[in-house]
Structures are given as C-alpha cells and as structure tokens.
C-alpha cells in the first residue's frame, strides 16, 4: 500500500479561474527531495496538469509555463491551479513521491473535485 | 418508509447566482395536488427556502417574493433558485408532499449540494 496522501474532497475555483488546495503526505522518514504531481482524472484516463520537485529547505518551484504555483511547509504543499475554465471542472489528484534520499515512496490522494464556473462577461463600457 | 424523492448530488450556481435542478418523486398513484418545499440544511438545522403547491394540470406557482421558480411535468419538478451568493453554498433538500387526494404521502431527497461563487466586480466604466 502506498504512502498516505490527503487532499480536500471539493474545492471551488474563484470567478477568476483560480483554485487552491492543500496536499498533505504522511512520511515516516525525513525526505529531502519531494516531487509533487497534479493529475486530472477523466474516466480511466489520467493527464498530468503540472509537476514540481522541491527540496524541503527550498520553495516549491513549478515550470515557468506551468498552470500551477505552490508553496511547501514540512509535509504539506499548498497548490494553486490557475487559468481554469468551466470545461476544466473535474477530479484533480495529488501524487507525492519521496525521491531522495532512499527509500523511494509514492502515494496518491483520492482527488479533489474542482468546480469551475465561467464568469458572465462584463458589459461593454461605452 | 417515506416516498422516494430523487435529486442531483451537486449543482453549480451560475455566475449570476442562479441554480437549477430537477426533483423527481416516485408516486404509486396519481396525485392531483402536490406541495414542493426546498429546505436548506446547515448542521442539524433545516430552514425553508421556498415552497409551492401545484395541481397537476396547472403550473407550479411560488410566492411573488420567493427566490424560487419552477415548472412541473408529471412527477418531475424543475426548480430554480435565484439570487444566490457564496454564503448560500450548502445542501438544499427537496421535500415532496402528495396533498390530495388521499392517501397523504411525504418524501425527502438526500439533498443537492449547491456551490455558489461570487463574481468579480466589473471594472468601473469611466
């Protein structure tokens, strides 16, 4: 059985299309290097939304072109997904890997259902 | 055992604060007069949001000052709740009563979790 990973069941994206949630993992050892991946599940398909490797001393760093940002504190990672549209509503799974030092461990959360509502367009300013 | 009432588990309110869902009841007979009540559950507290009695021939009629509107077709009621704000996010339960002719039946659904996101204000038009 994999490492335990906890994440909220439901999150609402803001009207600007931003959703934030905490992903917490239960580690028996002291991992120095952790990789966090956000996966979107649609049916039996899983697609990677974003991923980042961070050292426990440093800030969590996602790729520059990533839709995600994040901060870490101990065994908790605060994840923020941006640019969400109504069509992005779905189940977002947090996967945590303890990459270094050995032993390698991996765990996946049960997923966070993110609901996104597209905003009404503002009236044209004449 | 009460009459079976079905309603969706989750509904998203639009960015204008409008949420719609169908409430369907299982009736063994042909009720001529039906009362539909929408209740909001917060903890163990239930508060009435709106209610309407309708005859199967006529349109569903809520009070003029009600936050709800609706239409009916057979044993299905299409409910719409308006003017919702983020603070109104919660579990909305559909209660159906077969008022006439006897026998009287009552049933309650498991509730629809309505999520509401307040829209960002539009920029001032100068």
């Amino acid at each position: 059985k994999g490492m335990h990973v906890a994440q909220p069941a439901v999150v609402l994206a803001s009207s600007r299309g931003v959703a934030s949630f905490v992903c917490e993992y239960g580690s028996s050892g002291n991992a120095a290097e952790v990789r966090v991946t956000v996966l979107r599940q649609a049916g039996s398909q899983m697609t990677e939304v974003c991923a980042a490797t961070y050292t426990v001393e440093d800030e969590l760093a996602f790729l520059d072109d990533s839709t995600c940002t994040g901060t870490s504190s101990g065994n908790k990672v605060n994840l923020t997904i941006q640019g969400l549209r109504a069509m992005d509503t779905g189940l977002y799974i947090c996967k945590v890997e303890l990459m270094y030092p050995p032993p390698y461990y991996v765990g996946m959360g049960n997923g966070t259902q993110i609901y996104v509502i597209d905003p009404e367009p503002c009236p044209d300013s004449d | 055992k009460g009459m079976h009432v079905a309603q969706p588990a989750v509904v998203l309110a639009s960015s204008r604060g409008v949420a719609s869902f169908v409430c369907e009841y299982g009736s063994s007979g042909n009720a001529a007069e039906v009362r539909v009540t929408v209740l909001r559950q917060a903890g163990s507290q239930m508060t009435e949001v709106c209610a309407a009695t309708y005859t199967v021939e006529d349109e569903l009629a809520f009070l003029d000052d009600s936050t709800c509107t609706g239409t009916s077709s057979g044993n299905k009621v299409n409910l719409t709740i308006q003017g919702l704000r983020a603070m109104d996010t919660g579990l909305y339960i559909c209660k159906v009563e077969l008022m006439y002719p006897p026998p009287y039946y009552v049933g309650m659904g498991n509730g629809t979790q309505i999520y509401v996101i307040d829209p960002e204000p539009c920029p001032d038009s100068d």
Partner: antibody, heavy 114, light 111 residues
C-alpha cells in the same frame, strides 16, 4: 520517449579506473534523483549509489565507499559514475535508473580482469 | 549479494498461470514495500509493479501481486510467449539502509 543510455564500460585491469556515463532524454532530468545499479554475471541486481536532483547529496553502499563517486551534470543531462581502484568483484553490467524506478537504461558492461 | 530469496527458475505453458515467490525478513519485506521488475534477455530491467503495489504504466492486468508476512508473490496469469524473461523483486532494508533485490527468477514458457 524517455531514454537512458549508458556508456563507458570496458575491460580494465584490477586497480584501474573507468568513468561511466548515462545520457538522459525525454524527461526533465534536472528534476529527478538518479541511481546506479549493477548486476554481476549470473547474479541478482544490486543498488550501489544514488544522487539527488541538484547533485548536492549522494548516497552509496559500503562496498564502493572511497572508490566510486556518483555525480551529474544537469546542463548535459548526464549522470556519471567514476570508478577507481577497481576489483574483480566489480565486474558487472551497470545500469542507471530514475530514483522512482520508472525507467532504466540498457546497461554497460564493466569487466575487471588481469 | 542477493538478500531476498527467489526460485532460480519457474516454467509454465501458454495460457497457464505461474507464481514467483520472494522471501525476505522482518527488516525488509515485512516492514517495507515490494517492487517487481521484468528483464528480457540482453536488456535493462523494466518496472512491472511499483512500490505502491500498483502496476506500472502499460503493464497488463495479467500481472498481480500479493504479500503475506515476509513473503511477496508475483502471479502471472494467461502466460504469453513474450513473458519469457527474468523477474526480480526488490525492497528497502531498514537494518542495512539499502535497497535489496532478489537473485532473479527465470521464467520459461513451455512449447
């Protein structure tokens, strides 16, 4: 497609040296810790060393301590194993692998013999 | 070198089911995960079962695992010709503080 390609294996005399390389492609190499694993002829696999993604921290088994050094160059997407004071018992196929064990290379043969 | 014990070889006919055992101790399999790898002749190992007990990407559900005490078992059902390979198990040893592997099991498909 993820690929790990080892090279540098050769026939070398006891007490000699070799440097193995593992070139990575198809994934963000600098984001992953890496391992070296070896397999002596007719024997099982043996993990010998690991390195974190930035190259600042390493770990290894006692049998290679002071003789082998694991390192990496993220700019070149390459993992290295510097092998000094080689012994006959170091004869094996050497594999590089990502630390989550998702991908392995095809191996490079090191033979230590006089 | 090999700390985990595996049978040197097993065999089975096409379509049959075979099991490969991997026995360790309370400091490795009894306390940690078990992963499984397939090694085709002349190639590097390929992960079959990850440390969380799930099949690696692209691995068919004919491959399954179980564990009881200090012994893990890989079961391959509906044997196919391409399953002929060496199979290795691994775990983390909390006493030795190192990854430990089995000696490998050669699976032969009988014609």
């Amino acid at each position: 497609e993820v690929q790990l390609v080892e090279s540098g294996g050769d026939l070398v005399k006891p007490a000699g040296s070799l440097r193995l390389s593992c070139v990575a492609s198809g994934f963000s190499f600098s984001s992953y810790a890496m391992n070296w694993v070896r397999q002596a002829p007719g024997k099982g696999l043996q993990w010998i060393a690991g390195i974190n993604s930035g190259g600042s921290s390493t770990s290894h088994i006692d049998a290679i301590k002071g003789r082998f050094t694991i390192s990496r160059d993220n700019a070149k997407n390459t993992l290295y194993l510097q092998m000094n004071s080689l012994r006959a018992e170091d004869t094996a196929v050497y594999y590089c692998a990502i630390s989550n064990w998702a991908y392995w290379g095809q191996g490079t043969l090191v033979t230590v013999s006089s | 070198q090999a700390v985990l014990n595996q049978p040197a070889s097993v065999s089975g006919s096409l379509g049959q089911r075979v099991t490969i055992s991997c026995t360790g101790s309370s400091s490795d399999i009894g306390k940690s995960y078990v992963a499984w790898y397939q090694q085709l002749p002349g190639t590097g190992p390929r992960t079959l079962i990850n440390v969380d007990g799930n099949r690696a990407s692209g691995v068919p559900d004919r491959f399954s695992v179980s564990r009881s005490g200090n012994t893990a078992t890989l079961t391959i059902s509906g044997l196919q010709a391409e399953d002929e390979a060496d199979y290795h198990c691994s775990s983390w040893d909390w006493s030795l503080h190192t990854y430990v592997f089995g000696s490998g099991t050669q699976l032969t498909i009988l014609g």
